[in-house]
């Protein structure tokens, strides 16, 4: 069930087909009739024209497409979670800071997960860029630490309280996605009711030496314009109607009824069509492109 791009909205598609059918009839100007019907209908809705769906047509992250295709072709690979949300890095202005071989990348995520869902697993996915001399065969060996930036009070106002979420070593020979388990933190965020969270990724050389040109560089791709923007992937389980949802989902995948992401509610978690699709289809993948800033 490979996913193609989303060019034409279902509403526009339906209207054009409707028009073609009527215009084939002789003796009646059905285009005019159709237009007047459309105008009347829009008038009752207090609209001047059919609302454009451009805002809903957000390109889903590459990884979310991969996940859907993976689960559609191999149902045994499906996790116990029935909802997968993707949250993009919202910090589009901060630049990485470098000194003494240490680089810091600020990230910002607006995460909302309903309280009735159980968070099964959460991953921070970072695209690591390995930059090295092609003549050097060795890869790049680095330590990566993910911090949550907290708050300070009183005399410590200038200091940023930091909490290590996960730390690990990366040996990179090629640019690729790296995954970090942040399940505990996401569960805490969900239960605490806070949604805006600042993270900071630290990359340092493994042996505390300053980076030199020969050892190569390892960076995180944080540019918002490409498909490698840092992602927070949250696998959760909506336990309100588990059995019913699983049956519907299996049916949907086996019959390949949902070739388009629009029908999966991938366009937006909190905007109309996506939410409606989610409720009706009990889809298992949601691409959350909205920004809800709340503390």
């Amino acid at each position: 069930s490979p996913i193609m791009n989303l060019e034409q909205s279902p509403l526009e598609e339906d209207m054009s087909l409707f028009g073609d059918v009527f215009s084939e009839q002789d003796g009646v100007d059905f285009n005019t009739l159709l237009q007047s019907m459309k105008d009347e209908f829009l008038k009752t809705l207090n609209l001047s024209d059919i609302p454009t769906q451009d805002s809903a047509k957000v390109d889903p992250p590459e990884y979310m497409l991969e996940l859907y295709n993976k689960f559609a072709t191999d149902r045994t690979s499906m996790p116990s979670a029935n909802i997968i949300r993707s949250f993009k890095n919202e910090d589009l202005f901060s630049q990485p800071v470098s000194f003494n071989g240490l680089r810091k990348y600020p990230l910002l995520f607006n995460v909302s997960i309903p309280h009735h869902e159980e968070v099964i697993m959460a991953e921070l996915r970072l695209y690591t860029l390995v930059q090295r001399d092609r003549m050097i065969y060795d890869g790049v060996d680095r330590k990566i630490t993910i911090f949550e930036v907290l708050e300070s009070k009183g005399d410590n106002e200038g200091e940023r309280n930091m909490l290590v979420l996960v730390s690990g070593e990366i040996y990179g020979t090629n640019s690729e996605w790296e995954t970090f388990d942040v399940t505990d933190a996401i569960r805490r965020w969900q239960k605490s009711g806070s949604s805006t969270h600042q993270l900071e990724v630290h990359i340092e050389s493994k042996h505390d030496e300053a980076e030199d040109a020969s050892s190569g560089r390892l960076e995180i791709d944080t540019s918002a314009q490409n498909k490698h923007n840092p992602l927070l992937i949250v696998f959760s389980d909506d336990q309100s109607s588990d059995k019913e949802r699983k049956e519907e989902l299996n049916e949907m995948i086996s019959h390949e009824q949902l070739p388009e992401l629009d029908n999966l509610g991938l366009d937006s978690f909190s905007s109309g069509p996506g939410e409606e699709a989610l409720l009706q289809m009990r889809s298992n993948i949601i691409y959350d492109s909205t920004a809800r800033i709340r503390r």
Partner: antibody, heavy 119, light 109 residues
């Protein structure tokens, strides 16, 4: 494991350096090394933390700033320099390790070293 | 500054009973709360972090709950080995005040 040393009797207004040595592991990214103290019969009081990674960023309780200095002496040793000591600083000083810069969630502790400030 | 208020200061319960200790923060600490157990002459031992997550090796008789400013530690099926002083600690703020609560002494009869 962690082990503190350097405690003992010190005169008021005097100075003392406490040492925390890690065995079976060396300091690296991913956690903070901290000092916490406990006056006799009293509760726990956070003093300071230092990041074990290369940045070595330090954090202090506001009351400890200026008089206490935490530092990384080596890949297995953290020290706490205490100056202008008073009787109120008499306590058992613990070295501990955790993921929070504020000394949060300290999962590994040393047995402590007793500091007595008295003339 | 954030102040952690722990109640009661002392509690006595029989073996097999249940003890509940409360910890109140003067501000929302977003579930960044830990509980420690300390016995005389020993360093503290981490029991619970992030309000409800059990540290490694801690029995499920202990449980933590709460959010916002109100948190609770419960110990059920009390054993003699549970006799100790218990402390809560907030981790959300680097505070000028005490990040630890004042402690609760648990006596098992």
């Amino acid at each position: 494991s962690l082990e503190e040393s350097g405690g003992g009797l010190v005169q008021p207004e005097g100075s003392l350096t406490l040492t925390c040595i890690a065995s079976a592991f060396s300091f690296s990214s991913g956690y903070y090394m901290c000092w916490v103290r406990q006056a006799p019969g009293k509760g726990l009081e956070w003093i300071a933390c230092i990041y074990a990674g290369s940045s070595g960023t330090t954090y202090y309780a506001s009351w400890a700033k200026g008089r206490f200095t935490i530092s990384k002496a080596s890949s297995t040793t953290v020290t706490l320099l205490m100056t202008s000591l008073t009787a109120a600083d008499t306590a058992t000083y613990f070295c501990a390790r955790g993921p929070g810069a504020s000394g949060y969630r300290l999962g590994l502790w040393g047995p402590g070293t007793l500091v007595t400030v008295s003339s | 500054d954030v102040v952690m208020t722990q109640t009661p200061a002392s509690v006595s319960e029989p073996v097999g009973g249940t003890v509940t200790i409360k910890c109140q923060a003067s501000e929302d600490i977003y579930r960044l709360l830990a509980w420690y157990q300390q016995k005389p002459g020993q360093p503290p031992k981490l029991l619970i972090y992030d309000a409800s997550d059990l540290a490694s090796g801690v029995p499920s008789r202990l449980s933590g709950s709460g959010s916002g400013t109100e948190y609770t530690l419960s110990i059920s099926d009390l054993e003699c080995a549970d006799a100790a002083t218990y402390y809560c600690q907030q981790g959300y703020y680097i505070s000028g005040g005490d990040s630890f609560g004042g402690g609760t002494e648990v006596v098992v009869k």
